[in-house]
Every structure is written in C-alpha cells, then in structure tokens.
Interface confidence: low
Amino acid sequence: RGVFRRDAHKSEVAHRFKDLGEENFKALVLIAFAQYLQQCPFEDHVKLVNEVTEFAKTCVADESAENCDKSLHTLFGDKLCTVATLRETYGEMADCCAKQEPERNECFLQHKDDNPNLPRLVRPEVDVMCTAFHDNEETFLKKYLYEIARRHPYFYAPELLFFAKRYKAAFTECCQAADKAACLLPKLDELRDEGKASSAKQRLKCASLQKFGERAFKAWAVARLSQRFPKAEFAEVSKLVTDLTKVHTECCHGDLLECADDRADLAKYICENQDSISSKLKECCEKPLLEKSHCIAEVENDEMPADLPSLAADFVESKDVCKNYAEAKDVFLGMFLYEYARRHPDYSVVLLLRLAKTYETTLEKCCAAADPHECYAKVFDEFKPLVEEPQNLIKQNCELFEQLGEYKFQNALLVRYTKKVPQVSTPTLVEVSRNLGKVGSKCCKHPEAKRMPCAEDYLSVVLNQLCVLHEKTPVSDRVTKCCTESLVNRRPCFSALEVDETYVPKEFNAETFTFHADICTLSEKERQIKKQTALVELVKHKPKATKEQLKAVMDDFAAFVEKCCKADDKETCFAEEGKKLVAASQAALGL
C-alpha cells in the first residue's frame, strides 16, 4: 500500500533496471557485491557487475527470457558463488553457497566484516589523481564506490551514490583549477569526514533493526520524525515511519536496488505532500533526486505548532488511558511518543525513547491495578531524573572540553574508557575515544536547546561502533552487557561503569613504548594517534595511575618527540632518549 504499492513484475531485475536506469543499476550492484565480498579485487567485481548488467538488459528486452523471473537474491547470490577463490579468500563464507535462498543471503549478511583486514586508503598526489580521473572517469568513480563499499559494508547505498556524485564534481572542478591541491584537498577531506559519519549513522540503524528488531527502529523513527515534522499529523508521521522502515530494512538486508528505488519513491511522496508534512522542505524538493533525498534526511526541524495542549490531558488525566492503551498498545504508545517528541526538539531521541519506555512500564503495571488512575497519576514525575541525567552529564563534559580543548579532552576520555573496559583492544579504544571526544567540538558550541539532541544521539552512534567492533571479537562481559541489554540505555550503561577492579594489569613491554624517527614525518593527526595509543597502553599497565602521573608521563613523551624530531641524528636520539623516557616513566608510575 501507499508509496510502495506496485504491480507484480514478471522480472524483478528488469523492473529495477528500468526504474533506476543503467548507471545507477550498475553502481548499486557494484556496491552490493563489494559489501558482500570485501576482499575481491576491483577487476573481478567489475566483471561480475558487467555480466549482471548484460543479463538485466536481456530481461528488459524480454521479461519472459530464461532466468529473468528469478529473485534478485537468487541472481546475485548465484553470481557471487561463481567466484573461483571464494574458499581460499573467505574461508567458511564459501559454505553459504551450499544453502538455498533466503538462507544463503542471510549467511552472506552474517559474514559482513565491520573491520576488514584491508590496507588504509592512501591518497595519491593530486596530479596523479587528476590524470587518473581524466584518463578514465568511469573507472575512477567505480573505484571510489568499490573502495568505500568494501570498507563500510553497511554504508547506505543510495547515499553513497550522492557521495560519488560530489566526488566527481570535486574532480571535475578542481582538476582544471590553477591550484588543484588547494581546491581539491579540502573537498576530499570534507567528503571523507562526512562519509565516515554517514557510515556510522547507518551502522546504528542497521544494528537497531538487526539486533533489536523493527519495533525498536520504528520507535526511533517516530521520535525523530516527530521532532522534525511537528506540524504533521500522527497518521502522516506513521506512514512515513512505515515507509522509511521498509527502505532501511532493505538496505541493511543487502537489497540495494529495492532500497534505492523505494527511497526515491519516498522522497517523491514527501515532496508531493509537503503541505501536510513540513514547511522546511521547499528547497530540498527543488533539487535533483540524490541531492533531494539527502537534503530531506538532513532537513532542519520545522517550527512547533503554537497552540499544542498539555500532554497530561490525554496521557495522564483522561479516564480512558487504560482503555486506549489496551485497544492498541503500540498505536497508543506511538501517539505518546509522537506528542512528546514534537514538543521536545531539545531532547535527544534516546531520551524520548527512555521516557516512552517508562510510560509503557507504568501503564503495564497500573492498568492491572485496583485504581489505575491513582497508580499512573504521577508518571510524569518519574521523567524528571531521566531528563536531568543527560543534561548534567553534557554540562560537565562541555565544561571539561572547553577547559582542555579537543586533544586533551579525548585523552581524558581515553583514560576513562580504558579504566572502564581495559580488555578492549587498544586500536578500538583509541578510535572510539577519539570519536567520543569529537562530541565537544561538534555539540558544545550549540545553545542549550540543541546540545542534548546533538550530543547524546551522536554518542549513540559512536558507542554502536564500539559494540559492532567488540561483537566481532568479544573480550569484555561489561561491553557485551551494555551493548545488548537496551539500545536506548547504552550510553547511560557505559557512563555508569566504574574502574574494572577485576582487571589484571598487562605485563610491561618496553617495545610498546619504543619510537622511531618515522613519527616525525607523520601528520599531526597521526602523531596524536601514536601518543594516544601509548596512553592507552600506559593505563593498561597501570590502571590505578592518577591523572597527575599520566599527565606527567605524557608531557615528558611530547617533549621527547619534539626534541628528537629536531635532532640532527633523529634515529639515535629516539633510541637513546627513548630508553631514558621508558625508565623515567616506569619510575614515575611505579611499574
């Protein structure tokens, strides 16, 4: 029904090819294949995509042709299973090919790797990139899709098409500029940072659907869309939520052609019904498709209607609360969430979901009580501590951020989180704590009314990175517990963790603290990561070290790097001064 009501098609592959057009069809199939077979060479994927495209064209010409009636999963799965080196490259993933659909696709999905063993993407010289772009634009852009998709197997495919369009525009403009590097590099940096953020946000949506189910995702979507479209009727929001859930379920499930097609339909619907959705959509709806969909996804919150009545009337004071709840629990809770969220653009989505959960729990208990109204009359009082907890946490952390600056704020979080969960791998702790620390620059600049939605919803995205990386190789029961018990309480769960008293400190290994002259040629960011890696290792060796002790060692370390990078014989300096630094640090920390 609705946006996605379609006639039955004899050939699904022909239908999607016609809907999406050849260029988007090929790009999406490439993304799909690269997200499944993350280790396969680029050339192999291009060959598979070309074969699928040629086959799709035969089905467009004659939908009754042989195999054209097969499902996309069957066609794509059969194609992936023709890869000769599947067993050698992917090990047990090759066993997926012995299964029938839909089990085969589920098997491929389970083998997606959030942290694939792939080399870091090194950016070539600008002239080299521009030459490659001009020599073969199509291959150059396909390579971009391939490299991003295989490193980010849950990247939102239609959004990756938008990134590729911007990537192409950057090269088209900058490769003919007088100063190519000055034009291109900032644009590529922006695309890289936005791309990482987009990937992480989508990863949370997929985790929400896959680990906590459709109901959890729909609740998130009701809250977010109600904040964004407070003038829209509940039924309109519900319809958008249903359609959005279908889109993300498809993309998270590897059904990228259906996902992109349905996302385009949803954007069309939203723009055709702007009047009953939001006054902020006009500019978005004038853009071409990819830009339009992106713009709608990022659109600012509409103004709240001026005359919204008190929530208490319908959800506390009314004698029909239990009757309405019993008649259709999820609809009634959805209405509560909608009404609360549209009134509170200043709350994070996860806070709104905690409030809805508290309301649900209260009704479950009270509607079975002797006097239900008396029982739930004070339910809104229970919200106060739930609201104050993130408010206070954000206030304290923004004060700390303003006092320390981003790098030192990250270091404070590195120490805090290493003490909480010291079993987690050092690279993961560094990556996650650096990202947690970015909340300061991202959100503390905002006025009070925008801080909480910015900060807490961003922290949910970052903590999900920790959860998916930890799931691959679980090492900490505390992380598993916080990640799996409740999606909306992940952040409070991690915040509540104290120092892990059961942790046995790591043996001291001088090699971990041996540095070489190559550190001097690193970018400032890479150098910070080296220092932060050392800091995590220090805490793992000495979890009871005080802030002052750690600060002294880190200051000595910074001075040591600075001194040796200025020395004539850098390598000798690092060898000799490094030994002294290790000895001094051991003494300072009592190792």
Partner: nanobody, 115 residues
Framework: QVQLVESGGGLVQPGGSLRLSCAAS????????MSWVRQAPGKGPEWVSA????????RYAESVKGRFTISRDNAKKTLYLQMNSLKPEDTAVYYC????????VGQGTQVTVSS
Amino acid sequence: QVQLVESGGGLVQPGGSLRLSCAASGFTFGSFGMSWVRQAPGKGPEWVSAIDSGGGDTRYAESVKGRFTISRDNAKKTLYLQMNSLKPEDTAVYYCTIGRSTSRVGQGTQVTVSS
C-alpha cells in the same frame, strides 16, 4: 491490520447528491485525522477534504467547497462525505485515507456523474 472500506458510490445525474461512507477498523479511529481523496481515470490522486480527530476542524479543496461536507462518527468508527450539486468533473474513484495522506488503503467507491 488497518482496514478502510468505502461505500455509497453510484451513478448520479449532474446536480444530484450522494453520501459516501468509510468504515474503519484495526486502529484507534478516534485518534486520527481523516481525509477523502479521489482519482479520476488517467489522473493522479486529488485530495478532496479532511477532518481532524475530534471532528471540529474541516478542510476542503477549492473545487468542492460549498458543495461537499465531511463528517465523522467516532463511536461507529465511520467517516462520511455528503456530496451535493454534483458535476461531471466529480466523476472518480473516491477513497478515504488516514491523515492528509493520499496513499490508498481501501478499494474505493466509484462515483459517476453523467446525464
């Protein structure tokens, strides 16, 4: 399962009247605004009229203002559209929807205005 079943359509002469009904089930009818939408042969859906959940606020498309009246009975979970002074251009399949959506749920009811 949300269900909307429209009835009351038929063949009528220009200037005549019809009363359409829409029986709702599967959701808390009294909590939702509702609309009537129509689709003429070969054309896209056209929003006709809307009513808020309590029935106090009604809206109409310019083309039907003064001729059509939307109402509801929340106890019976039914939405109505009283159509007077019908014109040939009112010929279409009429269906009711939740909110201001133009998404079709029910099968609709055919209204034909012809002499």
